[in-house]
């Protein structure tokens, strides 16, 4: 139930987060499951634990295995498992499927490729980007924060994109790479002021306390490929990443679909283990392009509300 797959390449940094959460003040102990051997916390070790994080600096193939993290709460010890696989570097340019993160799609005038897992690392811009092992050069490619923007995308831009960055730990630098596929949807068309298909304006969405909930922000921007079109969620007028609630996350990247010939984007907001407090928040679905911005507001309500004191 509390298990997570992680993978990396030998001689690169790999950082893994414990699947169990807890207050920042809680101690987290890590163990190598096969031997029950404790992972040290001293940073002089190549593999060491740092609170919720397990760090391989750098990783070795022999590090592969299942790691147990135990969050020491005041009452119980809560256990999670990280299934780590470290692979040998490929001699050729082929990136095997098992090293690939989720595929993202782009279009002629709207493309963003996010660098997977980068938020776990202590890195500084710029990122380096490669396609099929070749460094990306030219004004069409712009490394912006944790993603790559490709201007005037062509079908030939489809392929496997690798981001490379440096993780810094106490003055020492370690390389990290991550690869994902990029597909291109090619279509000529026109651009419109954004039309939000879902949610409806001032929609009330019923959710069950303690369960997971998904909110989809879906908007169309015209026909064919779009330039600078985006959908995103805000909480109480704040970006999801700035709001600081780990249970509430946007789906990484934006899914593009073509509905009745229209170019549409959707962004799923995932709320894990819905809390009473979530009902107090204002959820804004924002759709924007060169024509302007449209906002639809959603609020959550408890399904079949009853007095929770029973």
């Amino acid at each position: 139930k509390f298990s997570k797959q992680s993978w990396g390449l030998e001689n690169e940094a790999l950082i893994v987060r414990c699947p169990r959460q807890g207050k920042p003040s809680y101690t987290v102990d890590w163990y190598y499951s096969q031997t029950n051997k404790s992972i040290p916390t001293q940073e002089r070790n190549r593999v060491f634990a740092s609170g919720q994080l397990l760090k391989f600096l750098p990783a070795a193939v022999a590090d592969s295995g299942i790691y147990t993290c135990i969050v020491r709460s005041p009452t119980f010890n809560r256990t999670g498992y990280a299934n780590v696989t470290i692979y040998k570097k490929q001699s050729d340019c082929n990136v095997p499927d098992y090293l690939m993160y989720s595929t993202v799609s782009g279009s002629e005038k709207n493309s963003k490729i996010y660098c997977p897992t980068i938020d776990l690392y202590n890195w500084t811009a710029p990122l380096e980007w490669f396609k099929n092992c070749q460094a990306l050069q030219g004004s069409r490619y712009r490394a912006h924060k944790s993603f790559l923007v490709i201007d005037n995308v062509m079908t030939e831009d489809a392929g496997d994109y690798t981001c490379k960055f440096i993780h810094n730990e106490n003055g020492a630098n370690y390389s990290v790479t991550a690869t994902r596929s990029f597909t291109v949807k090619d279509e000529q068309g026109f651009s419109l002021f954004p039309v939000i298909g879902a949610p409806a304006q001032n929609e009330i969405k019923e959710v069950e306390i303690g369960k997971n909930a998904n909110l989809t922000c879906s908007a169309c921007f015209g026909k064919g490929t779009q330039f600078l079109a985006a959908v995103l969620w805000q909480l109480n007028g704040t970006k999801i990443t700035d709001f600081g609630e780990p249970r509430i996350q946007q789906e990484e990247g934006q899914n593009q679909s073509f509905s009745n010939g229209l170019a549409c984007l959707d962004m799923v907001l995932r709320i894990a283990d819905v809390k009473e407090e979530d009902l107090l928040l204002q959820y804004d679905c924002l759709a924007l392009n060169l024509h302007g911005l449209r906002r639809h507001t959603v609020r959550l309500s408890r399904k079949n509300p009853i007095d929770h004191h029973s």
Epitope: R20, P74, F76, G210
Partner: antibody, heavy 121, light 106 residues
Framework: QVQLVQSGAEVKKPGASVKVSCKAS????????LHWVRQAPGQGLEWMGT????????VYNQKFKARVTMTRDTSTSTVYMELSSLRSEDTAVYYC??????????????WGQGTLVTVSS | EIVMTQSPATLSLSPGERATLSCSVS?????MHWYQQKPGQAPRRLIY???KLASGIPARFSGSGSGTDYTLTISSLEPEDAAVYYC?????????FGGGTKVEIK
């Protein structure tokens, strides 16, 4: 919707035992630890202990350790609190309670309606 | 165990007045939770993690503090705020509650 429904009031004689039940619904029973808190008439709240329904593991307040037993039945999503060697000062309302988000221990967001246990000869 | 001391034991104020309830802890804790209890009812969570307002709780309730001293404030008392208020720590086992502060509305 989360509900914690407790068994009815009990009258017991000193030296006897009492077993109070708390049936949970509206969420995945094994995902959340359940706690027991008691309140003597006109007094404050006192934490007795907690049970992890997934494993059956328990943590008791040392004050009750010799006399309290918490168990669970996953098939009925019910936890039980048994207190033995009852004395008059055990007369109290007994509550089961649950945190909102288990891993964050963010206070008791859900409470049962309470079970009054009266110990009298 | 961590001992929680609430003061005052009783607070008698008029509607619209500001109520300040204190909770002093025998050793430092990271967070504090606050509950309201009315006669014949189960406690109700008001504030969690020191300052976060629980769902459905009016904004006139607020919490603050750190270390060994924590405060619950009711900015403008309403008649329905008459109740006993408890602080609780979840820093170490056994979990403990304060003895309560009774708020009376004149």
């Amino acid at each position: 919707q989360v509900q914690l429904v407790q068994s009815g009031a009990e009258v017991k004689k000193p030296g006897a035992s009492v077993k109070v039940s708390c049936k949970a619904s509206g969420y995945t029973f094994t995902d959340y630890e359940l706690h027991w808190v008691r309140q003597a008439p006109g007094q404050g709240l006192e934490w007795m202990g907690t049970i992890d329904p997934e494993t059956g593991d328990t943590v008791y307040n040392q004050k009750f350790k010799a006399r309290v037993t918490m168990t669970r039945d996953t098939s009925t999503s019910t936890v039980y609190m048994e207190l033995s060697s009852l004395r008059s000062e055990d007369t109290a309302v007994y509550y089961c309670a649950r945190a909102f988000y288990n891993d964050y221990d963010d206070g008791f967001a859900y409470w049962g309606q309470g079970t009054l246990v009266t110990v009298s000869s | 165990e961590i001992v929680m001391t609430q003061s005052p034991a009783t607070l008698s104020l008029s509607p619209g007045e500001r109520a300040t309830l204190s909770c002093s802890v025998s050793s430092s804790v990271s967070y504090m939770h606050w509950y309201q209890q009315k006669p014949g009812q189960a406690p109700r969570r008001l504030i969690y993690d020191t300052s976060k307002l629980a769902s459905g709780i009016p904004a006139r309730f607020s919490g603050s503090g750190s270390g060994t001293d924590y405060t619950l404030t009711i900015s403008s008392l309403e008649p329905e705020d008459a109740a006993v208020y408890y602080c609780q720590q979840w820093n170490s086992s056994p979990l403990t509650f304060g003895g309560g502060t009774k708020v009376e509305i004149k």
